[in-house]
Structures are given as C-alpha cells and as structure tokens.
Amino acid sequence: VSPTFQVVNSIAPVQECSTQLDIVIVLDGSNSIYPWDSVTAFLNDLLERMDIGPKQTQVGIVQYGENVTHEFNLNKYSSTEEVLVAAKKIVQRGGRQTMTALGIDTARKEAFTEARGARRGVKKVMVIVTDGESHDNHRLKQVIQDCEDENIQRFSIAILGSYNRGNLSTEKFVEEIKSIASEPTEKHFFNVSDELALVTIVKTLGERIFALEA
C-alpha cells in the first residue's frame, strides 16, 4: 500500500484467514477399543468446536487396524453440521492388529493430498488416537520423520484402557505414542485411563490445535 493508501500491487494470500487448518484424525479401530461410542462421542465433542468449511477448517478421518479406510476426505463436507452427522455414523472396523505406522503413513500420503481436499499452504494437523503398541513398530520412526519433513503437526492420544483391563504395564506403549507426537511432547501428547475418559481431553486438545492457527 502506498503512502496515499492506494494498492500498489497485491498478492493473493495463501490463507484467506487465520482459521484455516487441514486436520486428519487417525483412529485405531481395532477390537480392543471399547466401547466404540466413546470414540464417536470424543469426535462429536471435538468437531463441534470447529468452524468447518472449504475456506475454514477442513477435517478428514482415517480408521486403521489391520488395514486402513478413509472414512471421509478433507473436502467431503462443507459444514460442521455435515461432519458431525458423518462422524456419528463411523462404525468400528475391528481386527486384532494395530498397524499404527500404516495408518499414519496412509494419512500422510493419501489423506493430505490435493485430490482428497488438502489445500496448498494450509497448515496440516494429524490427530492419532490408539490404545495399543503397533504391530508395525519397526516402521514408525521413518513414518514420523516423513511427517516431520512435510510439516505435519501431530497430536497423539494413548488410551490405556486395554492395558488397565489386563493389568499390563503401559510404559512401553506410552513411550511409543509419545514418539509420534510433535515437539514439545508435553503439548502434543495425551493419555487417558480408558475410552470413556476421552471426552475429558477435548477442551485442552481443541485449544492446542487452534493455537496452531495463530
């Protein structure tokens, strides 16, 4: 802008406003997640806080276990209301395997593509929810590095329910899920005692995600 307040030249901003994020939620859908409606309740509480639309925040959901399913793409729905209806209908796909590296890698390579609605220049956020050590743990380090290289901010949530039900040590599991989270870990990693407690972290998780918009 010139001293006389005339537009000298203009470059269209990459982001129209500061509330743009592309968020992909990566859900563990293996059998040990129980009850599943605790996950859909968590999704509902988190998503209803978001201003979802093609020029605002976009949300996609991926579910994994033994394999990976794109529940819906980033550009599938254009309002919070539509996303809430769709998220409520997500069914647990089951399975005994927890292929977390595969889930994250598929989200990075596929869910965050322009073909599925990702927008150039918009901050990418991944939220990973799981309740067990991955069966493809050997791939995790590289997969996380690939996310890092593509500037994907990662929030990871460890559900301790199946460990507590079986009186098992959570130490190794927690370390693995911490390793998925972006730095600083204490702002990007959450753990909950069981599936029913997922809703207790929604407010803090939401605030931390939206802090990225600033």
Epitope: S30, Y34, P35, G166, L168
Partner: antibody
C-alpha cells in the same frame, strides 16, 4: 446390514456327532469375535465359548471345555459348534452372536450386539 | 465367577406403567461392564443396554440402564405392548460372560 445366519434345526440320537454353523455377512467377519450361547428349554442363557475367525483363536467357558469344539472357516465367513458324542442334556437352542469388544491378551470383555436366529438341537 | 441375581422373577404390569428390573452381582462388576438383553418367545435375544447405561442402536429412549459396582437397574419408563418379554442382564468384566436367570415382564 450385519447378519448372522445359522443352520437349521437338528434331531439326533444320543452318541451321534453334530456340527452346526453360523455365517456372518454385512461386516468384516474375520475381524470380530463370534460367541456361542446355549439356552436349554425354558431356561436362561449360558455362554459356551468364543472364536476369532481371522485366526481361529478360541476360548471356552469352563463349563463347556471338553464338551464341545468351536471352529471357523474364514474363507466362507462361518463359525461352527460341534459335538463328537451328543447327550440328551445337549437338547437346547444354540445362538451365535457377534462380540463388540475383545478377547486378546488374556482379557475378555464386550457385549454381543448381533445374534443369529438360533439353531434348535434335539437329542432323543 | 460372578453370579448375577435378577429380581423379581416375574413382574406383572399394565401397558403405560413403569417397570423397574434389578440385577445384583455377587462381586463388583469391573468398569460397569453390564449389558441388558430382551428376549421374546421364539426369538433370539436383542441387545438393549451396554456399559450399564448406554442404549444400543435403535433402542427407544423409554429403556434406560443405571447402576455400578454390584447393583444395576433396567427401567422401562412406559411399557408398550411389545415390551412384554424376558429380560436378562449379563456381565463381561471377568474374561467370561455370565447371565442372570431372567425377569419376565408379563401383562397384568
């Protein structure tokens, strides 16, 4: 639509063998546990055992261990309950049901969300 | 194993009335892992409630569950003609599943 379809009613003599089936559809059958439940005439429900069709991992109720065999053929999405030598006391309705939950790592939990229509077995 | 005792054995009520069914466990049911099923004559059981208080898909809101520890309740706020049936509670917190003996809700 999730469905569990069981084989038809059977009339057998004591000492005979029998295998009844439960075929799942409308969901990934290899990814959910299937349980078997007995209901003797005019009585309540008793859990017999459970199988994971994906790898045939099986757990039995202590009351039924050694009395029956639970198996599965994942290629045809079917679970089975079999007896090698039937007794009159095996006369009952047998239900299969899908477990919403898990039975891994020695800990089992979950509810049965979908049920088959039942197979009546009469031994006399 | 956990033994579940249901009471009363039979409940005689009229349509429109409130039904309260009790299920008592011989020891605490972990994580309130208790379900309720309805069974009508010549039909398979149908899931109503799980985790003590969560209604299964498609179950009308006149059915509600409550309780924790050893005492659980199924309430039918206003009985409809199709609600007359046998109701079973089931616990699943101990690596096995046990059922109560059932409560019959019959038309008075």
């Amino acid at each position: 639509e999730v469905q569990l379809v069981q084989s038809g009613a059977e009339v057998k003599k004591p000492g005979e063998s029998l295998r009844i089936s439960c075929k799942g559809s409308g969901y990934s059958v290899t990814s959910y546990w299937i349980g078997w439940v007995r209901q003797m005439p005019g009585k309540g429900l008793e859990w017999m055992g459970i199988i994971y069709p994906g790898d045939s991992d099986t757990r039995y109720s202590p009351s039924f261990q050694g009395q029956v065999t639970i198996s599965a053929d994942k290629s045809i999405s079917t679970a089975y309950l079999q007896w090698s030598s039937l007794k009159a006391s095996d006369t009952a309705m047998y239900y299969c049901a899908r477990l919403q939950g898990d039975c891994s790592g020695g800990t089992c939990y979950g509810h049965f969300d979908y049920w088959g229509q039942g197979t009546l077995v009469t031994v006399s | 194993e956990i033994v579940l005792t249901q009471s009363p054995g039979t409940l005689s009520l009229s349509p429109g009335e409130r039904a309260t069914l009790s299920c008592r466990a011989s020891q605490s049911v972990s994580s309130s892992y208790l379900a309720w099923y309805q069974q009508k004559p010549a039909q398979a059981p149908r899931l109503l409630i799980y985790v003590a208080s969560r209604r299964a898909t498609g179950i009308p809101d006149r059915f509600s569950g409550s309780g924790s520890g050893t005492d659980f309740t199924l309430t039918i706020s206003r009985l409809e003609p199709e609600d007359f049936a046998v109701y079973y509670c089931q616990q699943y917190g101990t690596s096995s599943w046990t059922f109560g003996q059932g409560t019959t809700v019959e038309i008075k």
